[in-house]
């Protein structure tokens, strides 16, 4: 049995502009004020960190300036958006939530959201 419960959608289709959004929801056992959210990508048994943000409850998520992720929080829900996706980025994106402060520390891992990215067809040249 996993530790803290984390729920996320099974499948999301990225937009034609390479943007995918999904909600990561966790069942908090305590009254955490500081939460860390990490998005991990799993492909061929390799797991890489896509982005991470630590936020204070009630405040906005702050990702690094060069991050491909943005997000907002509302209670125990985090709305995550990943941009700049290409077809080669199709894969399983796992939401990891850590309740950092105050003690106790709780960790939860979602089952992952399969994000499908389809590169847009190039516009045909028009002879006008």
């Amino acid at each position: 049995c996993k530790a803290m419960h984390v729920a996320q959608p099974a499948v999301v289709l990225a937009s034609s502009r390479g943007i995918a959004s999904f909600v990561c929801e966790y069942a908090s056992p305590g009254k955490a004020t500081e939460v860390r959210v990490t998005v991990l990508r799993q492909a061929d048994s390799q797991v890489t960190e896509v982005c991470a943000a630590t936020y204070m409850m009630g405040n906005e998520l702050t990702f690094l300036d060069d991050s491909i992720c943005t997000g907002t929080s509302s209670g125990n829900q985090v709305n995550l958006t990943i941009q700049g996706l290409r077809a080669m980025d199709t894969g399983l994106y796992i939401c990891k939530v850590e309740l950092m402060y105050p003690p106790p520390y709780y960790l939860g891992i979602g089952n992952g959201t399969q994000i499908y990215v389809i590169d847009p067809e190039p516009c045909p040249d028009s002879d006008f």
């Epitope: 049995c1 996993k2 530790a3 419960h5 069942a27 908090s28 056992p29 305590g30 009254k31 991990l40 797991v47 796992i94 990891k96 850590e98 950092m100 003690p103 106790p104 520390y105 709780y106 960790l107 891992i109």
Partner: antibody, heavy 115, light 107 residues
């Protein structure tokens, strides 16, 4: 100051029951998943059981070695957690620690199983 | 169940040295790993949580690192007070298995 006080250990015959208690203070007990962990020279530290809190409907989890014999329970109004141990075996011997989500630990109580 | 393989089982080092203890897991535990210090005759004490975070009141000479299936605990500038047995533990999922422990002694 955080305190966890375990009681109830001692000498017990194989096959007999024993109940351990742990009273906590100094932290918000209801926010914590409470666990029992035991320590023996043969097995080192071994997680035994966990009881989660109200948001998790007081779910219980056990190690395979004690499943069906041990029962963990809690009383948030008394900031207490219990371990009812039935049909005790030699391999259950050790120091039993009560721990709040592994952040805070009690001093331990020794359980000896012998005829 | 997740298996924890801790090494070495014992370690002897001199005051001022830096030592490293490693913990391997049978599957990816996504950083769900704690380290504990247990001194002779005392209860275990949380040292590092979530693989890299130092627990309140613990010396900054202790640091944790790792991800996936491989983790390590580093003790810098060894003190005589660091004599203890150190354990890693999976906290991602039940059963919350512990490593076999590393007994640290001072030369």
């Amino acid at each position: 100051e955080v305190k966890l006080d375990e009681t109830g250990g001692g000498l017990v015959q194989p096959g007999r029951p024993m109940k351990l208690s742990c009273v906590a203070s100094g932290f918000t007990f209801s926010d914590y998943w409470m666990n029992w962990v035991r320590q023996s020279p043969e097995k080192g530290l071994e997680w035994v059981a966990q009881i989660r809190n109200k948001p998790y409907n007081y779910e219980t989890h056990y190690s395979d070695s004690v499943k069906g014999r041990f029962t963990i329970s809690r009383d948030d109004s008394k900031s207490s957690v219990y371990l009812q141990m039935n049909n005790l075996r030699g391999e259950d011997m050790g120091i039993y620690y009560c721990t709040g989500t592994f952040a805070y630990w009690g001093q331990g109580t020794l359980v000896t199983v012998s005829a | 169940d997740i298996q924890m393989t801790q090494s070495p089982t014992s370690l002897s080092a001199s005051v001022g040295e830096t030592v490293t203890i490693t913990c391997g897991t049978s599957e990816n535990i996504y950083g769900g790993l704690n380290w504990y210090q247990r001194k002779q005759g005392k209860s275990p004490q949380l040292l590092i949580y979530g693989a890299t975070n130092l627990a309140d009141g613990m010396s900054s000479r202790f640091s944790g690192s790792g991800s996936g299936r491989q983790y390590s605990l580093k003790i810098s500038s060894l003190h005589p007070d660091d004599v203890a047995t150190y354990y890693c533990q999976n906290v991602l999922s039940t059963p919350y298995t512990f490593g076999g422990g590393t007994k640290l002694e001072i030369k």
